[in-house]
C-alpha cells in the first residue's frame, strides 16, 4: 500500500478514502514533493505582505512587502519601512545620514565614508549623504605641484549609530 | 520610541457598543497596518482584526460582522467598535502594530460587560 | 483556522537553567511564526519572528528553532526577568492565531 502512494506526484496527494488513489490538491493548497497523504495550505500574503508568486498545486505561495516595505528574515517573515537613500531608520522613524556616513539604498544604516588616507589615497570626490567618497591617486602619484584639493574625509566610530 | 497609547470606555452594560481609541506615536503611521487584539481575563490572546492607513480591514470571521475599525490618518488615530457585547466580551484589549508578527503594542484597556 | 498548541502549559524551572517550550500548528506553517513574552499587567512584546529571527533587542538567551508544525523556543540560562508568560503566534494565514500559552515559573 505504501508503494501506491509513492506513486502520486507533486501536485496530488495519496487519498486514503478513496483506495489510495492520486487525488489532486484541493484548492489553495499545494505538495511540493511526491507521495504526500496530504497537502499543505497555500501562504496568505496579505496585510503588510503581498503576492510575489501565487501558490500553485505544486508550490507554495511567495509573500513580498507592500510597496514602501521592505523583507526581513527568512520567507520573508516581516516588513521594514523603506527610508531614501542618505537616510537610516532608526527607533523614531527615518532620520538622514549624520556628517561623514552615506547609505546608498533604501535600508540598512548609515555607514562612515571611506578614509582615503588609509590606504595611502586622497579623495577625488566628496562623500555626501546618499554615496561613499571617491578615492584618487596617493598624493605621491600626482605630478609635481598638483595636489589633493580635498582633505581625507573623516571616519566615524566604529558602533556610532545616529539615534 | 514607536509609542501606541489607546484608550476608552471600561465599563460597558450588555447589547452596548465597545469603542476603544489608540494614538500612535513616533514612527510612521501610514503604510502600515494597525491591530487589535484580546485577552479575556486569565486566558489566551485572540485576534480580532486590522486597518491599514487606506482604510482597507480585515477581521476575525468569529466576530460575525459585530466589529467596525475607523482610522483618522490626520491624528495618526484608529478606533475599534463593538456591538452588541455580551459578557464574553469582557476583556483587556490591546492595539498593536502589524508588520508581519505584532512589533509595538499599546498598554491594554479593560472592558468589562457586566449588567 | 490554523490551531495553534503550546506545551506545557506551566514550565517550572530554577533560575540559570534551560527552558525549552513547544509550540505546534494544526497544519504547516512554514516559518511564519512569532514568539512573545507577557508580564502580568503588561502587553505582549514580540521576542522572536520568522521562527527563529530575534527581534531587536532581545537577547541572544532567547532563540527559536522549528518549521513545519513544530516550534521551539529556549531560553538558555533563565534570568530573574524571563518568568512570563509566552506565546507563539502564526500569521501564515488568516484569521491570525496565537497558542493558549506557556507560563514560566520560577522552581
Known amino acids: 500500500l505504501q508503494d501506491l502512494c509513492s506513486n502520486c506526484p507533486a501536485g496530488t496527494f495519496c487519498d486514503n478514502n478513496r483506495s489510495q488513489i492520486c487525488s489532486p490538491c484541493p484548492p489553495n493548497s499545494f505538495s511540493s514533493a511526491g507521495g504526500q497523504r496530504t497537502c499543505d495550505i497555500c501562504r496568505q500574503c496579505k496585510g503588510v505582505f503581498k503576492t510575489r508568486k501565487e501558490c500553485s498545486s505544486t508550490s507554495n505561495a511567495e509573500c513580498d512587502c507592500i510597496s514602501g516595505y521592505h523583507c526581513l528574515g527568512a520567507e520573508c517573515s516581516m516588513c521594514e519601512q523603506d527610508c531614501k537613500q542618505g537616510q537610516e531608520l532608526t527607533k523614531k522613524g527615518c532620520k538622514d545620514c549624520c556628517f561623514g556616513t552615506f547609505n546608498d539604498q533604501k535600508r540598512g544604516i548609515c555607514r562612515p565614508w571611506t578614509n582615503c588616507s588609509l590606504d595611502g589615497k586622497s579623495v577625488l570626490v566628496n562623500g555626501t549623504k546618499e554615496r561613499d567618497v571617491v578615492c584618487g591617486p596617493s598624493p605621491a602619484d600626482l605630478s609635481p605641484g598638483a595636489s589633493s584639493a580635498t582633505p581625507p574625509a573623516p571616519a566615524r566610530e566604529p558602533g556610532h549609530s545616529p539615534q | 520610541q514607536v509609542q501606541l497609547q489607546q484608550w476608552g470606555a471600561g465599563l460597558l452594560k450588555p447589547s452596548e457598543t465597545l469603542s476603544l481609541t489608540c494614538a500612535v506615536y513616533?514612527?510612521?503611521?501610514?503604510?502600515?497596518?494597525w491591530s487589535w487584539i484580546r485577552q479575556p481575563p486569565g486566558k489566551g490572546l485572540e485576534w480580532i482584526g486590522e486597518?491599514?492607513?487606506?482604510?482597507?480591514?480585515d477581521s476575525n470571521p468569529s466576530l460575525k460582522g459585530r466589529v467596525t475599525f475607523s482610522v483618522d490618518t490626520s491624528k495618526n488615530q484608529f478606533s475599534l467598535k463593538l456591538n452588541s457585547v455580551t459578557a464574553a466580551d469582557t476583556a483587556v484589549y490591546y492595539c498593536?502594530?502589524?508588520?508581519?508578527?505584532?512589533?509595538?503594542w499599546g498598554q491594554g484597556t479593560l472592558v468589562t460587560v457586566s449588567s | 483556522e490554523i490551531v495553534m498548541t503550546q506545551s506545557p502549559a506551566t514550565l517550572s524551572v530554577s533560575p540559570g537553567e534551560r527552558a525549552t517550550l513547544s509550540c505546534r500548528a494544526s497544519?504547516?506553517?512554514?516559518?511564519?511564526l512569532a514568539w512573545y513574552q507577557q508580564k502580568p499587567g503588561q502587553a505582549p512584546r514580540l521576542l522572536i519572528y520568522?521562527?527563529?529571527t530575534r527581534a531587536t533587542g532581545i537577547p541572544a538567551r532567547f532563540s527559536g528553532s522549528g518549521s513545519g508544525t513544530e516550534f521551539t523556543l529556549t531560553i538558555s540560562s533563565l534570568q530573574s526577568e524571563d518568568f512570563a508568560v509566552y506565546y507563539c503566534?502564526?500569521?501564515?494565514?488568516?484569521?491570525?492565531?496565537f497558542g493558549g500559552g506557556t507560563k514560566v515559573e520560577i522552581k
Open positions: 498593536a502594530r502589524l508588520t508581519g508578527p505584532f512589533d509595538y
Open positions: 513616533g514612527g510612521s503611521f501610514s503604510g502600515y497596518y
Open positions: 486597518i491599514q492607513h487606506s482604510g482597507s480591514t
Open positions: 497544519q504547516s506553517i512554514s516559518s511564519i
Open positions: 520568522g521562527a527563529s
Open positions: 503566534q502564526q500569521y501564515y494565514n488568516w484569521p491570525l492565531t
